[in-house]
């Protein structure tokens, strides 16, 4: 479906930044990260009836414009304006999974629950989950070498951006019930700091949004505690009750017996506490 | 002030082409989406194209656009364009263009017009 | 195609009434309020209304007030003025960056 006219076209340069440039702390951009992008925007339109008339060839001439030849310690949110609205999607609003420090099992239920998404359901969020990228101020290359990393080189950085802004997109999209997925054997359940916790939480629309529901998911078998009363479950409730949408709780005591009653809901072991 | 100011339009016969211009003014051009939207005589407003370039072009169409139409835009001239190609009889309208409010909140609605100039597609 | 469906399609109001202009949309718009209102004069271009189903834009009068979600919005007028006898469309904006309009509603004074 046209990809390797999409590849032919490519006039950027995309050889390796020369290893005497400037060395950040984190990993350097994925490789083939040009022909993975297209590669996924292609397959994401193709099974997505309500995003097939998008253009990926101007998906990746946006998503390129909002890093090449910019210092990559200097990205705004801006950057990337032309890539969120070419990525615009209307997904049910009421049917938003959002998650913090557990991905894998979010991701799982999702894919059995098929009518709930999380971001990375999306066509944004699938063509940049798991990658890395960056350029480099006044050159048309790819940092395969190095990026920066948020804590030791900078926090504007392009990844840390491009999560930042369609985490805020995602979260001011959703309405009705919101539900968030969160990590139980962390010391910190809710974690102010994480994107969950500084942009989604603080974005979610109250005039749109009724309820936020947490699923605090449990990693030991035998862990009977009721982690919704956690200190940082009640500064998660305290934080979304002052913006005016109320909060509920539940423990998922067995995530594995969660996901297999989500795919077979007339189970009769069902019935009883998950 | 912003204005937007359109021209190029004409009588032109079916499968002929036209090239629009929009000439903008009173605002900073490359921030902004600028997108044609037409109206056909004593009917409804239709959206075409846009195009925004803040480095490259980067523009996206109506699907049934897609291929007859091309938008494009000179920074140095401040104007953005519409190629319009194998022209038929229902592409007759008034041509707008039209920029988007700025900024993430207010994106996908347009708070500056051009007057139109009309397409007239006819032997 | 996505289409957006006004109604009515002509409106006959007298200075003073409340109207109230509805407007449908085969799909949900984006992030479930992403729908503007215009006014369009005869040979003059649209002017825009109202944004995110209920914000005003600027300058525009207070009379004017919009509503909605998902797929059903309504503009309304408090109480018509003379200046508001006008054809008035909606718009949506949807996946990909795409934008639709109704076939508009023209208030005509009664």
């Known amino acids: 479906s046209g990809l390797n006219d999409i590849f032919e076209a490519q006039k950027i340069e995309w050889h390796e930044v020369p290893r005497w440039r400037q060395q950040w702390s984190g990993p350097g951009t994925t490789k083939r990260f040009p022909e993975t992008v297209l590669a996924r925007c292609v397959k994401y339109t193709e099974i997505h009836p309500e995003m097939r008339h998008v253009d990926c060839q101007s998906v990746w001439d946006a998503f390129k414009g909002a890093f090449i030849s910019k210092h990559p310690c200097n990205i705004t949110e801006e950057d990337y304006q032309p890539l969120m609205k070419l990525g615009t999607q209307t997904v049910p609003c009421n049917k938003i999974l959002l998650w913090s420090r557990i991905k894998d099992l979010a991701h799982q239920f999702t894919q059995v629950q098929r009518d709930m998404f999380t971001l990375e359901d999306t066509l944004l969020g699938y063509l940049a989950d798991d990658l890395t990228w960056c350029g480099e101020f006044n050159t048309s290359k790819i940092n395969y070498q190095s990026c920066p990393d948020w804590r030791k080189d900078c926090s504007n950085n392009p990844v840390s951006v491009f999560w930042k802004t369609v985490s805020r997109r995602f979260a001011e999209a959703a309405c009705d019930v919101v539900h968030v997925m969160l990590n139980g054997s962390r010391s910190k359940i809710f974690d102010k700091n994480s994107t969950f916790g500084s942009v989604e939480v603080h974005n979610l629309q109250p005039e749109k949004v009724q309820t936020l529901e947490a699923w605090v998911i449990h990693g030991g078998r035998e862990d009977s505690r009721d982690l919704c009363q956690d200190p940082t479950i009640k500064e998660l409730e305290s934080i979304i009750s002052k913006r005016n949408i109320q909060f509920s709780c539940k423990n998922i005591y067995r995530p594995d017996k969660f996901l297999q009653c989500v795919k077979n809901p007339e189970d009769s072991s069902c019935t009883s506490e998950i | 002030e912003v204005q937007l100011l359109e021209s190029g339009g004409g009588l032109v016969q079916p499968g002929g082409s036209l090239r629009l211009s929009c000439a903008a003014s009173?605002?900073?051009?490359?921030?902004?989406?600028i997108c044609w939207i037409r109206q056909a005589p004593g009917k409804g407003l239709e959206w075409v194209a846009c195009?925004?370039?803040?480095?490259?072009?980067?523009?996206y169409y109506a699907d049934w656009a897609k291929g007859r139409f091309t938008v494009s835009k000179d920074n140095s001239k401040n104007t953005v364009y519409l190629q319009m190609n194998s022209l038929r009889a229902e592409d007759t309208a008034v041509y707008y263009c039209?920029?988007?409010?700025?900024?993430?909140?207010?994106?996908?609605?347009?708070?500056?017009w051009g007057q139109g100039t009309l397409v007239t597609v006819s032997s | 195609d996505i289409q957006l469906t006004q109604s009515p399609s002509t409106l006959s109001a007298s200075v003073g009434d409340r109207v109230t202009i509805t407007c449908r949309s085969s799909?949900?718009?984006?992030?479930?309020?992403?729908l503007a209102w215009y006014q369009q004069k005869p040979g003059k271009a649209p002017k825009l209304l109202m944004y995110?189903?209920?914000n005003l834009a600027s300058g525009v009068p207070s009379r004017f007030s919009g509503s909605g979600s998902g797929t059903e919005f309504t503009l309304t007028i408090s109480s018509v003025q003379p200046d508001d006898f006008a054809t008035y469309y909606c718009?949506?904006?949807?996946?990909?960056?795409?934008?639709?309009f109704g076939g508009g509603t023209k208030v005509e004074i009664k």
């Open positions: 039209a920029r988007e409010l700025s900024g993430s909140s207010y994106e996908g609605y347009f708070e500056s």
């Open positions: 009173g605002f900073s051009f490359n921030n902004y989406w």
């Open positions: 195009i925004y370039s803040p480095s490259g072009d980067i523009k």
């Open positions: 799909q949900s718009v984006y992030g479930h309020n992403w």
């Open positions: 995110r189903a209920s």
């Open positions: 718009q949506g904006y949807y996946s990909g960056g795409s934008y639709a």
